[in-house]
């Protein structure tokens, strides 16, 4: 069995960001399992006092695109599109710094999903980053934090 599949997103939790676009899943049954995890995580997030508005505005779509990455249409084999490293870093180090610290010390929040590790993403100017998924975090506002 080949590992990795492109299939239409059939869930509800991330539908407002993903619609029914084609997403990459590591195995055929994974979409349902991750949908359950994301739904549980969003329920927990919704009742949590640990999540600020400035963080949730971008963290939730980012988590959706990380959990259910678009398929890379330019690839001949099933391949996920990654988050953009610059946005990932602003999210982790600026907008959601305290939330990330809390989430890392509470792995049960995401259960079967790892938190995005920005260091694993290709550098912004590299060819591998050309097709990354951009959430639309306003860069300029945080540019001075970033350097």
């Amino acid at each position: 069995e080949e590992d990795g599949f492109c299939q239409p997103y059939r869930g509800i939790a991330c539908a407002r960001f993903i619609g029914n676009r084609t997403v990459y899943m590591e195995s055929l049954h994974m979409q349902g399992e991750i949908e359950n995890q994301i739904t549980a995580a969003f329920t927990m997030i919704g009742t949590s006092s640990h999540l600020s508005d400035k963080c949730s505005q971008f963290a939730i779509p980012s988590l959706c695109h990380y959990a259910f990455p678009y398929c890379d249409e330019t690839s001949s084999v099933p391949k996920p599109r990654d988050l953009c490293r610059d946005e990932c870093e602003i999210l982790e180090n600026v907008l959601c710094q305290t939330e990330y610290i809390f989430a890392r010390s509470n792995p049960m929040i995401l259960m079967r999903l790892k938190l995005p590790n920005c260091e694993d993403l290709p550098q912004p100017e590299s060819p591998e980053a050309a097709n990354c998924i951009r959430i639309g975090i306003p860069m300029a506002d945080h540019h001075h934090h970033h350097h």
Partner: antibody, heavy 120, light 107 residues
Framework: EVQLVESGGGLVQPGGSLRLSCAAS????????IHWVRQTPGKGLEWVGY????????YHADSVKGRFTISADTSKNTAYLQMNSLRAEDTAVYYC?????????????WGQGTLVTVSS | DIQMTQSPSSLSASVGDRVTITCRAS??????VAWYQQKPGKAPKLLIY???FLYSGVPSRFSGSRSGTDFTLTISSLQPEDFATYYC?????????FGQGTKVEIK
């Protein structure tokens, strides 16, 4: 079919070098961490290190730091373990294994292993 | 580094027996413990991860549980193909560390 195949093992003298390869098929290594784990004859498992092939980040166990280097070539879908300044205690079967970058599912596929013998 | 202390180091059992193997972490690892099975001359195979999740294709007679820093692998009814060495591993922090192994032999 998901497969990891190690090669490059053999007999080497103390102080010598070897380069092990881990060729992956059935999946793209960019979406995974590739780990190296070794097993000394009749003993347990020891983690050697891993690489995140997409970004090239590597982590090594203290016991091999400065002597072993992990690398990857995503175009060849292959990871490597360069072993320098080999010692008798490095004698082991070396396995590569994958670990999803996205999902909590540790070391779900392993290669068959390649034997490295360090002896004069 | 986190130490994983596994016990017993070996055990003898018969087909149909219920077998329990324990692993104790030297510090909190949450639920981040995996169990592997290894047969002579073969690579380890993943059985359980995140303490209690059964890996795809693994028979339901295998189960895992957690109590604090103690983790248990249970084989509810030992089958002939289950005679092997079992290892626990924490996947909470780098470096990931393994237990010393438990060899399950035929009585």
């Amino acid at each position: 079919e998901v497969q990891l195949v190690e090669s490059g093992g053999g007999l080497v003298q103390p102080g010598g070098s070897l380069r092990l390869s881990c060729a992956a098929s059935g999946f793209n290594i960019s979406g995974y961490y590739i780990h190296w784990v070794r097993q000394t004859p009749g003993k347990g498992l020891e983690w050697v290190g891993y690489i995140s092939p997409l970004a090239g980040n590597t982590y090594h166990a203290d016991s091999v730091k400065g002597r072993f280097t992990i690398s990857a070539d995503t175009s060849k879908n292959t990871a490597y373990l360069q072993m320098n300044s080999l010692r008798a205690e490095d004698t082991a079967v070396y396995y590569c294994a994958r670990d999803s970058r996205r999902y909590v599912r540790p070391l779900d596929y392993w290669g068959q292993g390649t034997l490295v013998t360090v002896s004069s | 580094d986190i130490q994983m202390t596994q016990s017993p180091s070996s055990l003898s059992a018969s087909v149909g027996d219920r077998v329990t193997i324990t692993c104790r972490a030297s510090q909190d690892v949450n639920t981040a413990v995996a169990w592997y099975q290894q047969k002579p001359g073969k690579a380890p195979k993943l059985l359980i991860y995140s303490a209690s999740f059964l890996y795809s294709g693994v028979p339901s007679r295998f189960s895992g549980s957690r109590s604090g820093t103690d983790f248990t692998l249970t084989i509810s009814s030992l089958q002939p193909e289950d005679f092997a060495t079992y290892y626990c591993q924490q996947h909470y922090t780098t470096p990931p560390t393994f237990g010393q192994g438990t060899k399950v032999e035929i009585k």
